[in-house]
């Protein structure tokens, strides 16, 4: 027979776990993971299962964004009665299993994390052979990822009437605070745009307009650090151009 | 059963290069990454470089020390992997060991029994 | 780099519990899991694979062998030491790159 289901119980266990006759299946992961961008990360998922002393054919699956139907991020496949876990998928090579499946554990590393990778990943697990069967976690582990801010964009633009504004998008986990400083200007929060939409990580600040030559800093900063960068205008007086 | 054979170490002087090779047999090779961990004469263990497998895209990682100078390779068709040393050094002076791990832990469950590189005038 | 720490020699008598040490210079645990393995060297052998991630036991080692430890602080033990124990144990973490090993503890026979 062949049955697809999904979990109730989605607790982290700290025990590894055994099958035996009475259990069903269930999974447990922890409801979040941080880590910080560029480190690695584990998703730990435990599982249980009715099939007593499964020794056959069996597909570990982790998939990111939505249960059942989002995009494969890592699988391997384990042939009957082996340990080995043989790899088929990696996404970018950065995922890697740390648990042994015929262990109840599907537990993940994440390597080289990037803001893109905060999302939520499912584990699941295929049984194929004399028992055909199979379990998807449901509510998933959530990925938080956090990230020092970097700004990705500083740039000098023009607006009407012959004058210039200043914009600056920086990335970071929490979202960054931007503050402008430069010429007359002190330090200016200047007119923040919120996350955009499907860029959560991304925050923009506006200087409108820039009334002295001189040199303008973007200064970002959350609580893993600060990053800044620069931008000069020098205006050709008498000519309608600029010099950035 | 695993075995993993070295062989390629000798004398060699100072800025000379040397190619050591490792030859596996007994396991899925293509399977797991492979690894040459290093230790000088009544030294402790260094770790040196990895190869990963073609799933990880062959991926190579190398000590910072020795990074510019060591190339790793693998031969999945032929079971075996290598290590191209170049600008050797006195301190590189070592039993070279070729070990073995699995896709999910960078710890080595099988060794080489290791071939000694001396790097002397 | 993570630079991990044991002491250099220890003295433990025969059918005794032989207890190992292995600090690291920061955590090298994340979920739970602990990227800490040790390893058997005897004089004139190549290491030997005793205890992957902090507690398992690797294939073919004798069950007097086990690992505890969590974050920055770990320990190999041996129940009941017998002659053939006789070697340096080293610890490695695979927590970040580099893989780093510790200097090894030389454990010898009071």
């Known amino acids: 027979f062949v049955r697809t289901k999904i979990d109730t119980t989605e607790n982290l266990l700290n025990t590894e776990v055994h099958s035996s006759p009475a259990q069903r299946w269930s999974m447990q992961v922890p409801p979040e993971v941080s880590a910080e961008a560029g480190d690695a990360a584990v998703l730990p998922c435990t599982f249980t299962h009715p099939h007593r002393h499964y020794d056959g054919p069996l597909t570990a699956i982790w998939r990111a964004g939505e249960p059942y139907a989002g995009p494969q991020v890592f699988r391997c496949a384990a042939a009957r009665g082996s340990e080995l876990c043989q790899t088929a998928l990696s996404l970018h090579g950065r995922f890697r299993l740390l648990g042994n499946p015929r262990r109840n554990d599907l537990s993940l590393r994440v390597e080289r994390l990037a803001l893109a990778d905060d999302r939520r990943y499912f584990c699941r697990v295929e049984f194929a052979g004399d028992v055909h069967d199979r379990y998807e976690s449901r509510h998933g582990v959530r990925l938080h990822v956090t990230a020092a801010p970097r700004i990705v964009n500083i740039s000098v633009l023009p607006s009407p009437a012959h004058a210039f504004r200043a914009l600056c998008t920086a990335e970071g986990e929490p979202p960054p605070a931007l503050a402008w400083s430069g010429p007359a200007l002190g330090n200016s929060l200047a007119a923040v745009r919120s996350p955009r939409e499907g860029h959560g990580h991304l925050v923009t600040a506006e200087l409108p307009a820039l009334t002295h030559d001189g040199r303008y800093t973007c200064t970002a900063a959350n609580s893993l650090g600060r990053s800044e960068a620069s931008v000069y205008l020098f205006r050709f007086h008498g000519a309608s151009g600029a010099s950035t | 059963e695993v075995q993993i054979v070295e062989s390629g170490g000798g004398l060699v002087q100072p800025g000379g290069s040397l190619r050591l090779s490792c030859a596996t047999s007994g396991f899925n090779f293509n399977d797991y990454f492979m690894n040459w961990v290093r230790q000088a004469p009544e030294k402790g263990l260094e770790w040196v470089a990895q190869i990963r497998n073609k799933i990880y895209t062959y991926a190579t990682f190398y000590a910072e020390s020795l990074e510019g100078r060591v190339t790793i390779s693998r031969d999945d068709s032929e079971s075996s992997v290598y290590l191209q040393m170049s600008s050797l050094r006195a301190e590189d002076t070592a039993v070279y060991y070729c070990?073995?791990?699995?896709?999910?832990?960078?710890?080595?469950?099988?060794w080489g029994q290791g071939t000694l590189v001396t790097v002397s005038s | 780099d993570i630079v991990l720490t044991q002491s250099p020699a220890l003295a433990v008598s025969l059918g005794e519990r032989a207890t190992i040490s292995c600090r690291a210079s920061q955590s090298v645990t994340i979920s739970g899991y602990s990227f800490i393995h040790w390893y058997q060297q005897k004089p004139g052998q190549q290491p030997r694979l005793l205890i992957y991630r902090a507690s398992n036991l690797a294939s073919g080692i004798p069950a007097r062998f086990s690992g505890s430890g969590s974050g920055t602080d770990f320990t190999l033990t041996i129940s009941s030491l017998q002659a053939e124990d006789v070697a340096t144990y080293f610890c490695q973490q695979s927590r970040k790159s580099p893989w780093t090993f510790a200097g090894g503890t030389k454990l010898e026979i009071k």
């Open positions: 070990t073995r791990s699995l896709t999910g832990g960078d710890y080595f469950d099988y």
